[in-house]
Amino acid sequence: LNTTILTPNGNEDATTDFFLTSMPTDSLSVSTLPLPEVQCFVFNVEYMNCTWNSSSEPQPTNLTLHYWYKNSDNDKVQKCSHYLFSEEITSGCQLQKKEIHLYQTFVVQLQDPREPRRQATQMLKLQNLVIPWAPENLTLRKLSESQLELNWNNRFLNHCLEHLVQYRTDWDHSWTEQSVDYRHKFSLPSVDGQKRYTFRVRSRFNPLCGSAQHWSEWSHPIHWGSNSSKENPFLFALEAEQKLISEEDLGGEQKLISEEDLHHHHHH
């Protein structure tokens, strides 16, 4: 399993303590070499990956990871039970949901088993390291002749997330973006019927339940409008990857959803 080394920028207040044996300045020992930084991310509070750059070691080394929770009932030192590997060298550890306690200080220790004195300990606030899955089931509906409303779902406690909506037309060289709070809906008050629109959304575990800096991946985009809108700005011909769900299916509301989500709508 090849791991991707992620660089967090969302744990500024985490403290890092390095325990290195003091050595005379004229004798450089392996134990004085700094260990790589461990970077942890909690994916949708389903599992956590703690990874390090194994290639930074002067020679291939299977570093070991231990962890515990500071000042809590879970303060017993635990060994990593599921290592991640990069080119057959340990480069991370995966923890499962039951081992994740978001609101207790997580302590992670990396150690060189050949040089037990060479170890480094870091303390992390896991609630600042949550990355949710991308928003799903994007739907569009017309609120009026010129107003669209975008809705979406998250596979997580919705009130914990904030969102970023981006939209553009086929004439735009850049996205326009709008922050959205936990309500996971967005209205575009003025739609130009001559243009095609694309919307996408991403989410972040902030600010109500944590202070994460990392966003989810972008949702699959959803598109609105097409050529026929040039004849009638409010008669939208839907492209191949879109379907219009009839009013009966949606209790009287006409909504537009992407094909992937349509498949999900009918089969789940």
Epitope: L164, Q166, R168, T169, D170, W171, D172, H173, S174, W175, E177, R196, T198, P221, H223, S226, N227, E239, A240, E241
Partner: antibody
């Protein structure tokens, strides 16, 4: 007149790093998303990375994800590309361009050569 | 990822000719298609965006058409300065933004 001037290219060994810069003038920098597009001499165009107007949203080609970082300094009207863990296949002429989705104006490019 | 395929890869034409270059997307991209011109040793230049909208300052002999998967760039009357390489690019499903492989237009 719109001007985009790239700098920072050069010869580097595999695994090495370079930081490219793009100095701009002649347009309202804050109004534009910006991108890097590269071209192996004599070959086609390959999109590398884009950043939105305020620097809050970045996108990367899979081939550079985790190794390259795009950033911008709106006060200095500049775009940057930090390239780490460079590989031979990153050898190309790197152009900065205005826009995230399509590219209105382009710089002449700065040449990056990755060779042992 | 969406693949963009241009045809022909190269073509020879004479001044005054009407020239058409085609670009095909591996899936529907609506009208999110853009065309560029690149001359040797120069940076690319945007010609057409949104399939058919002419970029400011581009001569009206250039035009674009198409929607969905099939697009064309037409030069109505070829001028000496039009000999160059032309690229199409989709901005529909991003990232990644993808380009066609290019069409080299040479003097016959």
């Amino acid at each position: 007149e719109v001007q985009l001037v790239e700098s920072g290219g050069g010869v580097v060994r595999p695994g090495g790093s370079l930081r490219l810069s793009c100095a701009t003038s002649g347009f309202t920098f804050d109004d534009y998303g910006m991108s890097w597009v590269r071209q192996v001499p004599g070959k086609g165009l390959e999109w590398v990375s884009s950043v939105n107007r305020n620097g809050g949203t970045t996108d990367y080609a899979d081939s550079v994800k985790g190794r390259f970082t795009i950033s911008r300094d709106n006060a200095k009207r500049s775009l940057f590309l930090q390239m780490n863990s460079l590989r031979a296949e990153d050898t190309a002429l790197y152009h900065c361009a205005t826009g995230e989705l399509f590219f209105d104006y382009w710089g002449q490019g700065t040449l990056v050569t990755v060779s042992s | 990822d969406i693949q963009m395929t241009q045809s022909p890869s190269s073509l020879s034409a004479s001044v005054g000719d009407r020239v058409t270059i085609t670009c095909r997307a591996s899936q529907s991209i609506s009208s999110y298609l853009n065309w560029y011109q690149q001359k040797p040793g120069k940076a690319p230049k945007l010609l057409i965006y949104a399939a058919s909208s002419l970029q400011s300052g581009v001569p009206s002999r250039f035009s674009g058409s198409g929607s969905g998967t099939d697009f064309t760039l037409t030069i109505s009357s070829l001028q000496p300065e039009d000999f160059a390489t032309y690229y199409c690019q989709q901005s529909y499903s991003t990232p990644p933004i993808t380009f066609g492989q290019g069409t080299r237009l040479e003097i016959k």
